[in-house]
């Protein structure tokens, strides 16, 4: 069971202190940019964090979603990374959610965060390069201090 | 770096309460869950609940302490407190306060210890 | 009540390779991670390992953490005189709702 709490905005970046974003396409991707070119690509930048009390002792439980015209909430249903548009419910009945993730501090860390499937155990939000893009998908955790899982969230409330 | 400060040493008289403090500094307090462990003298550690100041104040206890112990947190001075009632002689140890920001069971800080001595 | 056994003590030259094993049972380390934390003496306890196998940053890497089935153990090579300490094994227990410890070993580096 998981029971909505309170939101707020963020700005998401992997370690390379790109930004992520959601383009036209509604795909999540993640792209140099200055402060001002993510204050310019706003909302498509800013990401609504909502955090959610967990009936089991797993972490803070959190979706993501952004508001461009509709909302829309990052799902990783079969393994796949993709925003439905959808707001993030009140409560879910469930121990397992395709929208809901685990928001992790890195131990020795602090500011560093990962994001862990609650559907899929041991798979982490990452940023992978495909050919020129950089997509965001679900991964499963293959070797010790993986960067690509590694992301800074910084509050824009 | 957060850091844990606890409060200093106590000497209680048996039935009586003890509460020890445990400030956070240099981090966000309310994302992360705070357990409270013990360790009686030459033994191993015993952990005895946790509050996710976070969840608005959501607490868990062990099934041993329940009934005996109240763990509370105040968000505007970022500290957690742990009350102990009905305090016996087995009751002295060393009460450290952990906090565990990667997953509520992983206690990745922990303060430097608040010894509580129960003698009449 | 310990669910988590431990050896008391293990013992090891320099320079050498010692292991500390954990064992519980399907309600904890069967169903759950496994942490280990590392305490000198006169000290607060420090996390050394996570998830099984994972160490936090400042942890040298000559330690490391494995589990398999209902038990988990924790890998110290190149031992050095400041690994001289007490080592405790943590988990889930599902039965008892509630985290659980080993009892501890004390490792001498002789």
């Known amino acids: 069971y998981f029971g909505k709490l309170e939101s707020k905005l963020s700005v998401i970046r992997n370690l390379n202190d790109q930004v992520l974003f959601i383009d036209q396409g509604n795909r999540p991707l993640f792209e140099d940019m200055t402060d001002s070119d993510c204050r310019d690509n706003a909302p498509r930048t800013i990401f609504i964090i909502s955090m959610y009390k967990d009936s089991q002792p797993r972490g803070m439980a959190v979706t993501i979603s952004v508001k461009c015209e509709k909302i829309s909430t990052l799902s990783c249903e079969n393994k796949i990374i993709s925003f439905k548009e959808m707001n993030p419910p009140d409560n879910i009945k469930d121990t397992k959610s395709d929208i809901i993730f685990f928001q992790r501090s890195v131990p020795g860390h602090d500011n560093k965060m990962q994001f862990e499937s609650s559907s899929y155990e041991g798979y982490f939000l990452a940023c992978e390069k495909e050919r020129d893009l950089f997509k965001l998908i679900l991964k499963k955790e293959d070797e010790l201090g993986d960067r690509s899982i590694m992301f800074t969230v910084q509050n824009e409330d | 770096e957060v850091q844990l400060v606890q409060s200093g040493a106590e000497v209680k008289k048996p039935g009586s309460s003890v509460k020890v403090s445990c400030k956070a500094s240099?981090?966000?307090?309310?994302?992360?869950?705070i357990s409270w462990v013990r360790q009686a003298p030459g033994q191993g550690l015993e952990w005895m609940g946790w509050?996710?100041?976070?969840?608005?104040?959501?607490?868990f206890y062990a099934q041993k302490f329940q009934g005996r112990v109240t763990i509370t947190a105040d968000e505007s001075t970022s500290t957690a407190y742990m009350e102990l009632s009905s305090l016996r002689s087995e009751d002295t140890a060393v009460y450290y306060c952990?906090?565990?920001?990667?997953?509520?069971?992983?206690?990745?800080?922990w303060g430097q210890g608040t010894l509580v001595t129960v003698s009449s | 009540d310990i669910v988590l056994t431990q050896p008391p003590s293990v013992s090891g030259a320099p320079g050498q390779r010692v292991t500390i094993s954990c064992s519980g049972s399907?309600?904890?380390?069967?169903?759950?991670?496994v942490n280990w934390y590392q305490q000198l003496p006169g000290t607060a306890p420090k996390l050394l390992i996570y998830?099984?196998?994972h160490r936090p940053s400042g942890v040298p890497d000559r330690f490391s953490g494995s589990k398999s089935g209902t038990s988990a153990s924790l890998a110290i090579t190149g031992l050095q005189s400041e690994d001289e300490a007490d080592y405790y094994c943590?988990?889930?227990?599902?039965?008892?709702?509630?985290?659980?410890f080993g009892g501890g070993t004390k490792l001498t580096v002789l």
């Open positions: 998830r099984n196998n």
């Open positions: 509050i996710n100041p976070f969840y608005i104040g959501e607490t």
């Open positions: 952990a906090r565990a920001a990667y997953h509520p069971l992983v206690f990745d800080n």
């Open positions: 943590q988990s889930w227990d599902y039965s008892g709702f509630s985290t659980v």
């Open positions: 399907s309600s904890n380390i069967g169903n759950h991670y």
């Open positions: 240099g981090g966000t307090f309310n994302s992360y869950a």
